[in-house]
């Protein structure tokens, strides 16, 4: 019962986490204009992984995609890659975990197979969560670096009279969504791995029996049957887990009208 609850909870937590990772990846507010200690502008700038937006106090909002792929900063490309890998792994993990749920019966699937699938999905969730956390953290680090750089020359004098205000960017809502979502996916993955230990069946070991056939003196010693290891003598109570195949057959694609500003 506890195993089923742990597995179910792990699945739900991971599902929420992956939904959050998807939401964060699609959100436009990865970085937002810093309003603290800045002149009050009638224009508010914010940027996402895919486009940058400007909201005017009139209510008019305009977003422009990053039309170039090669012209984008390597760090931004890396963040995009990490988030997409996180989503793909998470989606595959969700698919695998659905079939691994103890409360769902699919044909005559054995508990050992469900244990393997639970472990596989758990590992996928952990990696997915780590990808999201890494992606968000890389972006946050990039923001902090740029923030202090722009603070150093916040006002650039032009001819001594005219001043140009440097727009500084700070953490946007997407970063917090990404961190929380990544953490949830990670926790869900750990819960799945814990549930897997309880799912793996305890092996029944049979005593070896000698059959004496007339005219032959051959002893047959059948070992415990194991789906994962084949036939053979197995006196130790070993639990063998198969990591399962990992395929990246699901690639998330986004509209590519992107031009970094």
């Amino acid at each position: 019962m506890a195993v089923t609850a742990c597995q179910g909870l792990g699945f739900v937590v991971s599902l929420i986490g992956i939904a959050g990772i998807i939401a964060a990846t699609c959100m436009d507010q990865w970085s937002t204009q810093d309003l603290y200690n800045n002149p009050v502008t009638a224009v508010f700038n914010y940027q996402g992984l895919w486009r940058s937006c400007v909201r005017e106090s009139s209510g008019f909002t305009e977003c422009r995609g990053y039309f170039t792929l090669l012209g984008l900063p390597a760090m931004l490309q890396a963040v995009r890659a990490l988030m997409i890998v996180g989503i793909v792994l998470g989606a595959i993990g969700l698919l695998v975990s659905i079939f691994a749920l103890k409360c769902i019966r699919i044909g005559s699937m054995e508990d050992s197979a469900k244990a393997n699938m639970t472990l596989t999905s758990g590992i996928m969730f952990i990696v997915s969560g780590l990808c999201a956390i890494a992606g968000v953290s890389v972006f946050a680090n990039m923001l902090v670096t740029n923030f202090w750089m722009s603070t150093a020359n916040m006002y650039t004098g032009m001819g001594g009279m005219v001043q140009t205000v440097q727009t500084r960017y700070t953490f946007g809502a997407a970063l917090f969504v990404g961190w929380v979502a990544g953490g949830l996916t990670l926790i869900g993955g750990v819960m799945m791995c814990i549930a897997c230990r309880g799912l793996a069946p305890e092996e029944t070991n049979y005593k070896a029996v000698s059959y004496h056939a007339s005219g032959h003196s051959v002893a047959y010693k059948p070992g415990g049957f194991k789906a994962s290891t084949g036939f053979g003598s197995n006196t130790k109570n070993k639990k063998i887990y198969d990591g399962g195949a990992r395929t990246e057959d699901e690639v998330q694609s986004y509209p590519s009208k992107h031009d970094y500003v």
């Epitope: 204009q33 700038n45 005017e56 106090s57 209510g59 008019f60 422009r64 205000v165």
Partner: antibody, heavy 118, light 113 residues
């Protein structure tokens, strides 16, 4: 057709109060940011206050902050400017305006005159 | 506050000529997020409220004749009236629409020669 009609202006003594109203029609008032702009007798234009749509952020000219309050009633499609502690320098023609792309003021009312004099 | 300086304060013109007026701001009105300049031009005729002519420094408001052209970036802006007509006699104001408080220039008054 977009229409902005101001009312509530008049003659008031220094230190007195006045409430200006602006009835809007011909556009979705609740989705628009609206402002008050005044024109002094010397014909200088001076932005006074802005109230945004949605969460209704308010912005004020420094010299009127704390004395003037901009507000809106989306149900009545009406913009207000509550003016108190009036000074002689507040004497002007007050226009109700709608903010457009680029924060430009694309529609203006005919204005209501406010005279602060003893 | 942003100071908007318009020049000249008045200009005597004749019908058909090209009219140019300038507006300078004390700070750049260029927004890096969308590369747009938040400067607006208005026309005010006697006894009327101001009328929007140009926003984003160069985008003509619908219904405004194409003889009106806005140009410039950062801190220096220009309004040009090609083939000036008698109906264009008015005071022209520029406005900072980037920083609060939104500030106006003192205006350029066009008078007929």
């Amino acid at each position: 057709e977009v229409q902005l009609v101001e009312s509530g202006g008049g003659l008031v003594k220094p230190g007195g109060s006045l409430k200006l109203s602006c009835a809007a029609s011909g556009f979705t008032f609740s989705n628009s940011a609206v402002s008050w702009v005044r024109q002094t007798p010397e014909k200088r234009l001076e932005w006074v206050a802005t109230i945004t749509s949605g969460v209704s952020y308010t912005y004020y000219l420094d010299s009127v902050r704390g004395r003037f309050t901009i507000s809106r009633d989306n149900a009545k499609n009406t913009l207000y400017l509550q003016m108190s502690s009036l000074r002689s320098e507040d004497t002007a023609m007050y226009y109700c305006t709608r903010q457009f792309k680029g924060n430009a003021l694309d529609y203006w009312g005919q204005g209501t005159s406010v005279t602060v004099s003893s | 506050d942003i100071v908007m300086t318009q020049s000249p304060s008045s200009l005597t013109v004749t019908a058909g000529e090209k009219v140019t007026m300038s507006c300078k701001s004390s700070q750049s009105l260029l927004n890096s997020g969308n590369q747009k300049n938040y400067l607006t031009w208005y026309q005010q005729k006697p006894g009327q409220p101001p009328k929007l002519l140009i926003y984003w420094a160069s985008t003509r408001e619908s219904g405004v004749p194409d003889r009106f052209t806005g140009s410039g970036s950062g801190t220096d802006f220009t309004l040009t009236i090609n083939n000036f007509q008698a109906e264009d006699l008015a005071v022209y104001y520029c406005q900072n629409d980037y920083f609060y408080p939104l500030t106006f220039g003192a205006g350029t008054k066009l008078e007929l020669k």
